[in-house]
């Protein structure tokens, strides 16, 4: 599999409509969660819990603020702290409680604590319950939350020093945490935790499963070095712990090593970076994307593996177990347990059959089989991704949250988009096409440049939004940006499934928001531009420059994967030539002009789709090089004249469906210059779709007017 | 103890200027975000202008948009307001006060009087 | 921008009794809502914020209730140097607007 290509399409910050929100000094804006039914997006920051509306996150609802006492901020700080970051309470659980409630945890100064967050006072109930096991003391340490039946499970470190990681169910009746042990867990780092319901037609009874996944330092693998593995863990929801072997712990804790590879390069992706689970009505199983990168990571290597659920479980169901051996110089070795396993299976959910065999609750497991997932939290097997490979291979990125949607296509094709966010601000929506990743566009979600701390996607039809939270603030982007392709050939070229071209009102639309039904829409996803009806309507632009003079003739191609090119009276001109130069890679510079440069100048784009070639005329110019005479001045406008050498530039629509051109008497232009009224337009020219024409005050056309221009393009 | 003590006030002419200033001592200048809040003579509060501790978002309402300036020296502790172009509607007592999210405008100073007339 | 109301204008009451102050927004504002008092000549002094949280300093006999457009301040017990007017802000949206003012009057 080769390094995915660069975006097709890269849309910066200000080109498109992003909503954003941020409260003035207010940072961190690390945990949201989306109401759906209440259209409400609550944003956990540092020192702060906002709600805001979620289809338009500009709209703050609610506020409500928990800060650290200065007491409390003095004793931090004498541990060593900081007082103006670290001894701040960072918002890190938000978690739906009831319909009525949320659950919120925070750092606290180095001091975690929880509380319930009523939602229709917006004030906290002030509980102040003990967040240790929930909630992380350090805002830079890892953790990870799920509230599942009204109990919170957590991944994150139990410490001061965040030295004792765990991984707990916070529970009135039945409370539960790992083993402090290297075998269980190893310095991990918390990536995600998601519930797994048990499905309503299964016929073994069985449990409702949490997943764990973070990365930690391998106890398989002996280097010179630490080697990190990606972990995927997973208890059991009916988990009562042990009577007496594992009292209060878990007897269902167990994981697996996930491999990301690129085989036939030996490219291991071993850090985890962050997973989301894919549930989706035609999917039987949920399949879950996993974002990775490579452990030594100096050139900026990120990847994307997908795996079914069912693979995962069938190794925990399955699956051979590791076991540590002592080799000489008490080294501890891990190697695959050949020997006999207990029954009922260890770290297995209790279902049908252990209840038949009288094994109702964990509480009743044989010491054995405690005793045995005690000792054997690793198994030996792996997790695989689907087709052994990764979905995704970007090189020069790192990537830091990622969100997929699964969509269909006009013509019934499923795909799974992914939304992939950078550390640098900027966000990646990829989707693979025929075994290849096309990476259809980038948006500069962040000005700034500033991590994507977390990513949420909406799955209410209709109004679709991915929201990104970073350290300034969160900002809230659509699925596509359809509109922005202006032609037929761009809208197709996206190869965007939720983008399609509609002929009747010639726009690119989202297939998702049109209510009507889909016939006559184009969408292309091999991007066979040449099922776009013919141009109906092309514009060129007319331009006048004094003799001697420079000119630049804009060619706007947004897509990346586009070569640029320029014609002159049919001929392709040599941008390398003293006479000409290319600025932005697109727009061309004529240098020391002369009448014999005027013409047709044509700026065409080449794309390669697959194995076809796509040319495009994107913009038409009709040059005029003039000597320039004495203004004539009409007797009621003053003119200053400045130097420079653009003297007019005018747009001109052709139509070849008989309808004559807009011919406003006078057009004012970029360089601020007047020009006379068009001549009629020559018909079938290409388009350069969206030109803004600003007329001023009519004149008369005999009135005859040059201005130069200071604008030396 | 927490002090807030403006200063440049005084009687201008329409269409002329002046920069209040705003000193702060007692707490830690450079954590809160600062506002300027006006009163006309027997009137109402009205907020004019704010900016954040860092100087990364400013607010200013519309009516003074273009004319009034709001700007911060975390170094010396202070807070300006550049007024120009001002109008007999500016006449005012011009307070400043600190805002943080969570704390509202906690803190006060005794303001400044500023008359535009001709 | 949002508007708020602030009645009645005048408020007059005898030392000793229960007194309520409203304030009621031209939109939902959640709770984001203080309350601010100003004695004749004074500066304004922060009393309640964000519709019920208590200010450090300031007589437990100031009260504030309500979410959403209706917002109430109260004093359980008016005192002679409660004379003042009283301001509410809203700060859901920029610009952070203030209330007309209630004034308050000992009879």
């Known amino acids: 599999m080769a390094f995915a290509p660069i975006p097709r399409i890269t849309w910066e910050h200000r080109e498109v409509h992003l909503v954003q929100f941020h409260e003035p000094d207010i940072y961190n804006y690390s945990a949201l969660l989306l109401s759906e039914d209440k259209d409400t997006l609550y944003i956990g920051a540092r020192e702060a819990v906002f709600a805001v509306n979620a289809l338009n996150i500009s709209e703050k609802q609610h506020e409500v603020y928990w800060k650290v006492s200065e007491d409390k901020k003095a004793k931090c700080a004498e541990k060593g702290k900081s007082k103006q970051t670290e001894c701040l309470n960072y918002i890190r659980v938000l978690q739906p409680l009831s319909a009525t409630s949320l659950y919120v945890c925070g750092t606290n100064a180095f001091q975690p604590a929880c509380d319930h967050l009523n939602l229709t006072s917006f004030k906290f109930l002030g509980k102040n319950e003990d967040g240790k096991g929930r909630c992380p003391f350090d805002p830079a340490h890892s953790y990870t939350s799920v509230m599942v039946d009204g109990e919170l499970y957590s991944g994150t470190s139990y410490n001061f020093l965040g030295s004792e990681p765990i991984i707990s169910r916070n529970s009135s009746h039945s409370p539960l945490r790992t083993e402090y042990a290297i075998p269980w867990l190893n310095e991990p780092s918390f990536v995600f935790a998601d519930v797994i319901r048990k499905s309503p037609d299964s016929p073994d009874g069985e449990d409702d499963r949490v997943y764990f996944f973070f990365t930690e330092v391998s106890v398989e693998y002996e280097f010179v070095f630490r080697v990190l593995i990606p972990r995927i863990a997973r208890v059991c929801k009916g988990d009562q712990g042990g009577l007496r072997t594992l009292q209060k712990k878990w007897t269902s804790f167990l994981k697996a090593r996930l491999i990301c590879s690129r085989p036939d390069s030996g490219l291991v992706f071993n850090v985890l970076r962050d997973v989301f689970v894919l549930r989706s009505p035609g999917l039987k199983v949920p399949v879950f994307y996993a974002l990775f990168t490579p452990q030594l990571n100096n050139v900026g290597l990120s990847a994307v593996c997908a795996y079914n659920l069912s693979t995962a479980e069938e190794v925990f169901s399955h699956g051979k177990y590791m076991q540590s051996t002592t080799v000489e110089q008490s080294h501890t070795k891990w190697v695959r347990y050949n020997g006999p396993v207990p029954k009922p299976r260890p770290g297995a959910c209790i279902d049908s059959e252990a209840r038949a065999a009288n094994y109702t609750s964990s509480l009743n497991l044989p010491d054995k089989t405690l005793q045995f997932v005690k000792d054997h939290p690793l198994m030996d097997d792996s997790v695989t991704p689907i087709d052994n490979r990764p979905r995704l291979i970007k090189k020069d990125v790192n990537y830091t949250q990622i969100v997929v949607d699964r969509t269909q296509a006009l013509d019934g094709t499923v795909y799974d988009v992914m939304f992939v966010s950078t550390d640098r601000g900027a966000l990646h929506k990829a989707i693979s096409l025929e075994h290849a990743v096309h990476i259809i566009e980038e948006t500069q979600l962040f000005q700034d440049f500033e991590p994507v701390q977390t990513l949420l996607l909406s799955s209410k039809k209709g109004n679709r939004f991915v929201y990104a939270g970073s350290n300034s603030g969160v900002v809230q982007a659509p699925l596509a940006f359809c509109g922005k392709h202006g032609t037929c050939e761009d809208c197709v070229l996206a190869r965007d499934p939720y983008c399609a071209w509609s002929p009747p009102t010639a726009t690119c639309v989202a297939l998702h928001q049109t209510e009507s039904p889909s016939r006559g829409l184009i969408q292309e996803m091999s991007g066979d531009a040449s099922v776009c009806p013919d141009k109906s309507k092309g514009s060129y632009r007319q331009h006048f420059f004094k003799h001697g003079g420079t000119a630049e003739l804009k060619c706007s191609q947004k897509s990346n994967l586009a070569r640029v090119f320029w014609k002159f009276q049919n001929g392709v001109l040599k941008a390398e030539s003293p006479k000409y130069g290319l600025m932005g890679r697109k727009n061309l510079l004529i240098f020391n002009l002369s009448e014999g440069d005027s013409g047709v100048y044509q700026c065409l784009s080449e794309e390669r789709v697959k194995n076809k070639t796509v040319f495009q005329v994107v913009a038409k110019h009709v040059l005029e090089v003039k000597v320039v005479p004495k203004p004539v001045v009409a007797p009621t406008l003053s003119v200053v004249q400045t130097e420079g050498s653009r003297i007019a530039t005018k747009v001109l629509v052709a139509s070849t469906q008989g309808s004559s051109p807009p011919t406003p008497a006078v057009q004012a232009t970029s360089s601020g210059a007047i020009t006379l009224p068009p001549k009629p337009a020559p018909t079938g020219t290409s388009c350069e779709p969206k030109i803004v024409i600003n007329t001023v005050p009519q004149l008369h056309s005999e009135k005859t007017m040059y201005l130069k221009s200071s604008d030396n393009r | 103890e927490v002090q807030l003590v403006e200063s440049g006030g005084g009687l201008v002419k329409p269409g002329g200027s002046l920069k209040l200033s705003c000193a702060a001592s007692?707490?830690?200048?450079?954590?809160?975000?600062m506002y300027w809040v006006r009163q006309a003579p027997e009137k109402g509060l009205e907020g004019v202008a704010y900016i954040s501790s860092g100087s990364s978002t400013i607010y200013s309402v519309d009516k003074v948009k273009g004319r009034f300036t709001i700007s911060r020296d975390n170094a010396k502790n202070t807070l300006f307001l550049q007024m120009t172009s001002l109008r007999s509607e500016d006449t005012a007592m011009y307070y400043c006060?600190?805002?943080?999210?969570?704390?509202?405008?906690?803190?006060w100073g005794q303001g400044t009087s500023v008359t535009v007339s001709s | 921008d949002i508007l708020l109301t602030q009645s009645p204008a005048i408020l007059s009451v005898s030392p000793g009794q229960r007194v309520s102050f409203s304030c009621r927004a031209s939109q939902s504002i959640g709770t984001s809502i203080h309350w601010y008092q100003q004695r004749t000549n004074g500066s304004p002094r922060l009393l309640i914020k964000y519709a019920s949280e208590s200010i450090s300093g300031i007589p437990s006999r100031f009260s504030g209730s309500g979410s959403g457009t209706d917002f109430t301040l109260s004093i359980n017990s008016v005192e002679s140097e409660d004379i003042a007017d009283y301001y509410c802000q809203q700060s859901i949206r920029w610009p952070y607007t203030f209330g007309g003012g209630t004034k308050l009057e000992i009879k």
């Open positions: 006060a600190t805002w943080l999210p969570g704390n509202a405008m906690d803190y």
């Open positions: 007692g707490f830690t200048f450079s954590d809160y975000g």
